[in-house]
Amino acid sequence: KFSKQSWGLENEALIVRCPRQGKSSYIVDWYYSQTNKSIPTQERNRVFASGQLLKFLPAEVADSGIYTCIVRSPTFNRTGYANVTIYKKQPDCNVPDYLMYSTVSGSEKNSKIYCPTIDLYNWTAPLEWFKNCQALQGSRYKAHKSFLVIDNVMTDDAGDYTCKFIHNENGANYSVTATRSFTVKDEQGFSRFPVIRAPAHNETKEVEIGENTNLTCSACFGKGAQFLAAVQWQLNGNKITDFSEPRIQQEEGQNQSFSDGLACVNTVLRIADVKEEDLLLRYDCLALNLHGLRRHTIRLSRKNPIDHQS
């Protein structure tokens, strides 16, 4: 659970994060697992520890091995292990499987390829991107922040994509490359103005005071992968996060795909221990995409005791 595989190429920078995380103020000690020898924190060393990070600047094949990190909070010491493998540079263009990060898939509507592990490094834009070792050129390719966007994705855009960037440490520059496969989903998708499936507009829901109730906001946005599709609840026109009432919590949006192929998202508003004042609120289900915003309002009313008895 608290062991993590990391890999890199010789003569490149490699930065590894301790699998046990904690506050930045927690002391983190790093050791070579085999020898129990402490890893120095002085930056003049080629391999040194910097808080939760272990830095190889640059890495050598001989650095391969298991490293122990101990995160020392005021109350507990928690141990993690980083299993590091440094490989020799490949003479040819082929990137072996063991150097590949997780595969990502995209479609015509969503073609972002994130550069793996880049958030660990001190880098500056732009990134360089390569496909099957060829530098990417042309207006279809846009390097944006830490990802690559491909316009009008086609099936032959599938392949291995490598990002290359420079890590800067105290004025010294080190090269880093990372490769992942990109697959293309052949999807005849489309996007349209949001359609809210639930609740109905101006609906009223009967609730019992003191009971728990759930309100579901469900909307569909078209077919296939959507570039932007969001649903959320608002209370009296305010975001849930701005409404300081822990009894009322919104769940993360859940993606759904119905039998008709529609791309839909829903989110549940959970209201615990319903109170009288909850009946005075306006609950808005908001659905948003690039076409615009649709809003359905629902209110709560007290369940009629006569109905309850029947």
């Epitope: 506050k23 103020s25 909070s73 109350t75």
Partner: antibody, heavy 121, light 107 residues
Framework: QVQLQQSGAELVRPGASVTLSCKAS????????MHWVKQTPVHGLDWIGT????????AYNQKFKGRATLTADKSSSTAYMELSSLTSEDSAVYYC??????????????WGQGTSVTVSS | DVVMTQTPKFLLVSAGDRVTITCKAS??????VAWYQQKPGQSPKLLIY???NRYTGVPDRFTGSGYGTDFTFTINTVQAEDLAVYFC?????????FGGGTKLEIK
Amino acid sequence: QVQLQQSGAELVRPGASVTLSCKASGYTFTDYEMHWVKQTPVHGLDWIGTIDPETGDTAYNQKFKGRATLTADKSSSTAYMELSSLTSEDSAVYYCTRYSYTNSPYGMDYWGQGTSVTVSS
Amino acid sequence: DVVMTQTPKFLLVSAGDRVTITCKASQSVSNDVAWYQQKPGQSPKLLIYYASNRYTGVPDRFTGSGYGTDFTFTINTVQAEDLAVYFCQQDYSSPYTFGGGTKLEIK
């Protein structure tokens, strides 16, 4: 949603022991520390100690060490605090509270409703 | 143990006023300070963590600042529902310790 449900009020004799429970729901019990806090009108809030439910490791405030014992049952997602050799000074409301140590917010973000303990002969 | 000295103990203010509570640590606690609100008959609620980060759902009239030994908690425009006791707490070193609390009353 996250909830910490504490056991009911206790009336105990001086010298006796009491065990309070705190049942967690709505999150992965082993991903957060469980802390216990004592509150009295005179002394305000006092940190008793904490348990890591994943490992069973504990840490105590020296003030309570030897008298407070924290345990956790992963199967029922319940944390317990036993307080022994009770005196009238132990009359207080006791809270269990969840503490995130791996990511923000680093703090006691959810609290139980509290258990009132009265020590009296 | 780190002693958290919180002042004032009591505050009597009018709705709309700006309120400032201070907490002084007996030694440096970096920015490992949280602020809690406890309304009458309720459990404490986390408002601010890491000295200045507002917890989810907390209105932006509540702010925190400070580093090292001196910390400040401010309510910019006090509302009637802010009637409560406010506590600071450090979790930089064990045992974790709380301030004595500030009781806020509305005129």
